[in-house]
């Protein structure tokens, strides 16, 4: 008899896009409409929740912009929280200082991406220093991962 | 009898590098010489053509530089075109404004990378706002993808 | 009789983080403590040594910062060395010029990431132009790869 058909495992992947009703940290994300992907990973209150231990490539881009530059320090972090650990672990971070001409309209992006060994129940979040300076267009600000 | 040898499927992957004879949008790319990769994906008139539906990590870097900074707004987009849809879809985008000191020699890169669900016959392209300010060195300006 | 259990091949992956005792080029990396990964790839004197030919996604981020901006040109390169070839091959590179306001405290990151066809015994390194301006926090400066 022929062997049973191979069960193709669903790829664990997420691509979430900017959501302009973020009011506080961590950033919240669009998980339903547009060019969003969410498969084999859960989204909960701004976080991507890992449900299978393994290696993941995690990435995020944030688009900062303002009408009148005053060079406020900008930071963009991807961090991990797990109930087993008391403290957040910053996985990747980008900082910018002195990046535009005082008084001018300005725009700048921060991109982060790397491989991590994640454990089931890890929660991943994105934090920025100046929420009011983030533009949430889906092509400009996003957060994602995939299991290798 | 032993089973037939497993047919190893070719990985769908592309890494194209800057081509300085780009005269208009979308950018054109070197698809033959140097550190170029093109396997299981076609290159046509600036675009990467998908021939198998699935999840892809898509990335691009563009290196902008100039001799006398005027702070013209810079944009770098990866977009998708498919004959089924009337309009281009901007998948990822980076913008820069007020990024250098007036009159000075300057240089800056924009990097984009994320996961998308692409469909057979999708065409992916890269667009920039100021073609004359792009440097096309193969290590500096590139466009690629791979199927997860 | 049931077939022998499938031997799950170890994923070839690395994620190395900044090491502040780097004194010269290429940069040296933390390969043991913290959020480091090293599996199926060797680390030797600043380099990641490939031991299996194939397609790899290679990435690096470097965080530059200083107390008083004088706009020294910054460069960040990922390059490859192989005993078969006389010269280093620059795979990816980022350059920055005129990126901050003279005299001010400043901070900026460079991110690189792309797919390459690597050969067994290739050594991959990271080079920067201004070592004294690099901050080596593990979340800010890193170097990694994984086999597709």
């Amino acid at each position: 008899p022929s062997p049973p058909p191979e069960k193709k495992e669903l790829r664990k992947v997420a691509h979430l896009t900017g959501k302009s009703n973020s009011r506080s940290m961590p950033l919240e994300w669009e998980d339903t409409y547009g060019i969003v992907l969410l498969s084999g990973v859960k989204y909960k209150k701004g976080g991507l929740v890992i449900n299978e231990t393994g290696l993941y490539f995690v990435y995020s881009k944030v688009y900062f912009r303002g009408q009148s530059c005053n060079n406020l320090p900008l930071s963009h972090k991807v961090y991990m929280r797990n109930s087993k650990y008391p403290q957040d672990l910053v996985m990747m971070e980008g900082k910018m200082m002195s990046y535009c001409t005082t008084g001018q309209m300005w725009a700048r992006s921060s991109y982060l991406g790397a491989v991590f060994n994640l454990t089931s129940a890890d929660h991943l979040y994105v934090n920025v220093s100046e929420l009011s300076l983030v533009n949430f267009e889906e092509s400009q600000t996003f957060f994602g991962l995939y299991k290798l | 009898p032993s089973p037939p040898p497993e047919k190893k499927e070719l990985r769908k992957v592309a890494h194209l590098t800057g081509k300085s004879n780009s005269r208009s949008m979308p950018l054109e790319w070197e698809d033959t010489y140097g550190i170029v990769l093109l396997s299981g994906v076609k290159y046509k008139k600036g675009g990467l053509v998908i021939n198998e539906t699935g999840l892809y990590f898509v990335y691009s870097k563009v290196y902008f530089r100039g001799q006398s900074c005027n702070n013209l707004p810079l944009s770098h987009k990866v977009y998708m075109r498919n004959s089924k849809y009337p309009q281009d879809l901007v998948m990822m985008e980076g913008k820069m404004m007020s990024y250098c000191t007036t009159g000075q020699m300057w240089a800056r890169s924009s990097y984009l990378g994320a996961v998308f669900n692409l469909t057979s016959a999708d065409h992916l392209y890269v667009n920039v706002s100021e073609l004359s300010l792009v440097n096309f060195e193969e290590s500096q300006t590139f466009f690629g993808l791979y199927k997860l | 009789p049931s077939p022998p259990p499938e031997k799950k091949e170890l994923r070839k992956v690395a994620h190395l983080t900044g090491k502040s005792n780097s004194r010269s080029m290429p940069l040296e990396w933390e390969d043991t403590y913290g959020i480091v990964l090293l599996s199926g790839v060797k680390y030797k004197k600043g380099g990641l040594v490939i031991n299996e030919t194939g397609l790899y996604f290679v990435y690096s981020k470097v965080y530059f910062r200083g107390q008083s901006c004088n706009n020294l040109p910054l460069s960040h390169k990922v390059y490859m060395r192989n005993s078969k070839y006389p010269q280093d091959l620059v795979m990816m590179e980022g350059k920055m010029m005129s990126y901050c306001t003279t005299g001010q405290m400043w901070a900026r990151s460079s991110y690189l990431g792309a797919v390459f066809n690597l050969t067994s015994a290739d050594h991959l390194y990271v080079n920067v132009s201004e070592l004294s301006l690099v901050n080596f926090e593990e979340s800010q400066t890193f170097f990694g790869l994984y086999k597709l």
Partner: antibody, heavy 119, light 111 residues
Framework: EVQLQQSGAELVRPGVSVKISCKGS????????MHWVKQSHAKSLEWIGV????????RYNQKFKGKATMTVDKSSSTAYMELARLTSEDSAIYYC????????????WGQGTSVTVSS | DIVLTQSPASLAVSLGQRATISCKAS??????????MNWYQQKPGQPPKLLIY???NLESGIPARFSGSGSGTDFTLNIHPVEEEDAATYYC?????????FGGGTKLEIK
Amino acid sequence: EVQLQQSGAELVRPGVSVKISCKGSGYTFTDYTMHWVKQSHAKSLEWIGVISTYQGDARYNQKFKGKATMTVDKSSSTAYMELARLTSEDSAIYYCARFPDWDYAMDYWGQGTSVTVSS
Amino acid sequence: DIVLTQSPASLAVSLGQRATISCKASQSVDYDGDSYMNWYQQKPGQPPKLLIYAASNLESGIPARFSGSGSGTDFTLNIHPVEEEDAATYYCQHSRELPYTFGGGTKLEIK
């Protein structure tokens, strides 16, 4: 045809100010920075400064800080330079010159504006 | 600031011969494989006109008898064969960093 048309010659008394103009035509004005250069018998050619025609931000040669003020009016594709508290040392021909950001040099120059300071 | 020293201050060359003008910079004007040195020609009552950019590149519309060479701190403008209309003052100028500076000029006379 690319042209940088400068305002006419000025004869002014010491201590006053003068504002000279440079109107660009035949190209996209905001794509090029505008530089100003002084030419006097004593000092040959001296770079005064540069202004971003796109965002209006200017950079000056230390020597001309407080002396020269550069501005732009994008709507009329015109760059201006005001020279303050004029002395006989400021008597010279002043040129505007555009600089393509993607190139290496000032490729087109205005015809020059002669400023003579005399009591 | 980078100081540019031109020599000679003036020279007279016979029609059809070679004119050579030197420009020395107080520090290198090279960066990343390029030399940021330019040459201009100025005739009386006219603005400077760009001849050579990035040390050796001929500006569009400039006759091929003009050529530039050099790197680092030492640069040369050559005109060969010299023609009547080449009588003018020639200036070198760097664009490596702000402030840009010019050489003192070389006045070319045709004999």
